[in-house]
């Protein structure tokens, strides 16, 4: 019987000859557990595993710790891949993180971190980032050093408030910090002066809620 090939990430999918954008089944490192992810095989050389996407407000991102852990939404549209998978994956080898952003005026920008990983659940999926380049601000809109992940039922931020309740969505909040790509989705002409929107401060400022965001990862040695 032929052994079924399993892929840890979209880079492995790409290298196996699958070079079309789409949903692929990935396998947790050192496990048989599977997860469906969207693979971008075109942008910047391909092989990108999409870990977050916002584009139309069709999915509620005000979710529980468990939902952010295992993932939610639809990989073909708005979704969160899952903190546990991303944590395990990014602790296996060095990954880069690219965050692609679109505003409502037709502009696009990105932030690229040359090293990205998430701590384990025991350490609240704390984000670790190094080496920022890109067009979405010279200062990182994800606070450095990285913060623990927080959700509406898992308050790990530094704020006296509960950032996830104030700003909505799960994120690596500080107090509450310069970004939240999992905030409320506001349509065009309702997207300004919103403290709880989809924010990337060092590109668009504090009250601007973005039109679309994508967070994607790929091995650094791809």
């Amino acid at each position: 019987k032929e052994e079924q090939i399993s892929f840890r990430d979209c880079a492995e999918v790409f290298k196996s000859g699958h070079t079309t954008n789409g949903i692929y089944t990935l396998t947790f490192p050192n496990s048989t557990e599977e997860i469906k992810a969207y693979c971008d095989m075109e942008a910047g050389g391909g092989g990108w595993t999409i870990i977050q996407r916002r584009e139309d407000g069709s999915v509620d991102f005000q979710r529980t710790w468990k939902e952010y852990k295992v993932g939610f939404g639809n990989p073909s549209g708005e979704y969160w891949l899952g903190n546990e998978f991303v944590s395990q994956l990014t602790n296996q080898q060095r990954y880069v993180l690219k965050i692609h952003l679109k505003d409502w005026e037709g502009n696009e920008a990105y932030s690229l971190y040359e090293h990205f990983y998430l701590s384990s659940e025991e350490l609240n999926y704390r984000i670790h980032l190094k080496g920022l380049t890109g067009t979405a601000g010279k200062i990182s809109s994800i606070s450095q050093p990285g913060n623990d992940f927080s959700t509406k039922d898992g308050d790990n931020d530094k704020c006296i408030c509960k950032c996830s309740q104030m700003l909505t969505g799960g994120w690596w909040f500080d107090a509450c910090g310069p970004s939240n790509l999992n905030g409320m989705y506001y349509p065009q002409r309702q997207n300004t002066n919103k403290f709880n929107g989809i924010k990337w401060y060092y590109w668009k400022g504090s009250g601007y809620s973005l039109k679309a965001t994508t967070m994607m990862i790929r091995p650094a040695d791809f």
């Epitope: 704020c159 006296i160 408030c161 107090a175 509450c176």
Partner: antibody, heavy 120, light 108 residues
Framework: EVQLVESGGGLVQPGGSLRLSCAAS????????IHWVRQAPGKGLEWVAG????????YYADSVKGRFTISADTSKNTAYLQMNSLRAEDTAVYYC?????????????WGQGTLVTVSS | DIQMTQSPSSLSASVGDRVTITCRAS???????VAWYQQKPGKAPKLLIY???SLYSGVPSRFSGSGSGTDFTLTISSLQPEDFATYYC?????????FGQGTKVEIK
């Protein structure tokens, strides 16, 4: 009508204790945070301590940590500030304030203040 | 601790003047956590602005707030006699909560 009324201030010797009360009316303290803020004569505002109803979390300024205790009796709709080991530098008008923990995320109502004088 | 550095510490102005007070935080603050208060001698402070730029109920529209990140501003567009007072910025996000040192607005 929302009201906060402080009481319990007065003259006390260094090392002594006082208990300030903040009686709330027109709202229930279970729905708000309560903070104590003080103002030394001729000086600016200094936050002292805060109490949150969810889990009864308490927060303190470093200058009073270990000496002051903030608490609340929700059945009496009253917050308290127990002040021990008082020092001359604790001399101030003490205000209690209601803090809204959504919007406006700020101290929207204040009491009239009660004067605490620490002197021998 | 977050320092809230206010400037100027005092200013003299005339009725009708436009007055601007600035407050710089020592680290990035979400704007919803920044407030401005007015205090007159012998009285408790009063909330003017919350969320850095939102006018509190009952406060005259000549008061406005702006800013984000680390730099915040209170503006009085046309100073009135009753506006002579001391103004404080405050952050309510991190413990300890901190106030600016105050700006005393005096009559020229």
């Amino acid at each position: 009508e929302v009201q906060l009324v402080e009481s319990g201030g007065g003259l006390v010797q260094p090392g002594g204790s006082l208990r300030l009360s903040c009686a709330a009316s027109g709202f229930t303290i279970m729905d708000y945070w309560i903070h104590w803020v003080r103002q030394a004569p001729g000086k600016g505002l200094e936050w002292v301590a805060g109490w949150t109803p969810a889990g009864g979390y308490t927060y303190y300024a470093d200058s009073v940590k270990g000496r002051f205790t903030i608490s609340a009796d929700t059945s009496k709709n009253t917050a308290y500030l127990q002040m021990n080991s008082l020092r001359a530098e604790d001399t101030a008008v003490y205000y209690c304030a209601r803090f809204v923990f959504f919007l406006p995320y700020a101290m929207d109502y204040w009491g009239q203040g009660t004067l605490v004088t620490v002197s021998s | 601790d977050i320092q809230m550095t206010q400037s100027p510490s005092s200013l003299s102005a005339s009725v009708g003047d436009r007055v601007t007070i600035t407050c710089r935080a020592s680290q990035f603050l979400s704007s919803f956590g920044v407030a401005w208060y007015q205090q007159k001698p012998g009285k408790a402070p009063k909330l003017l602005i919350y969320g850095a730029s939102s006018l509190y109920s009952g406060v005259p529209s000549r008061f406005s707030g702006s800013g984000s990140g680390t730099d915040f501003t209170l503006t009085i567009s046309s100073l009135q006699p009753e506006d002579f007072a001391t103004y404080y910025c405050q952050q309510g996000l991190l413990s300890p909560l901190t106030f600016g040192q105050g700006t005393k607005v005096e009559i020229k």
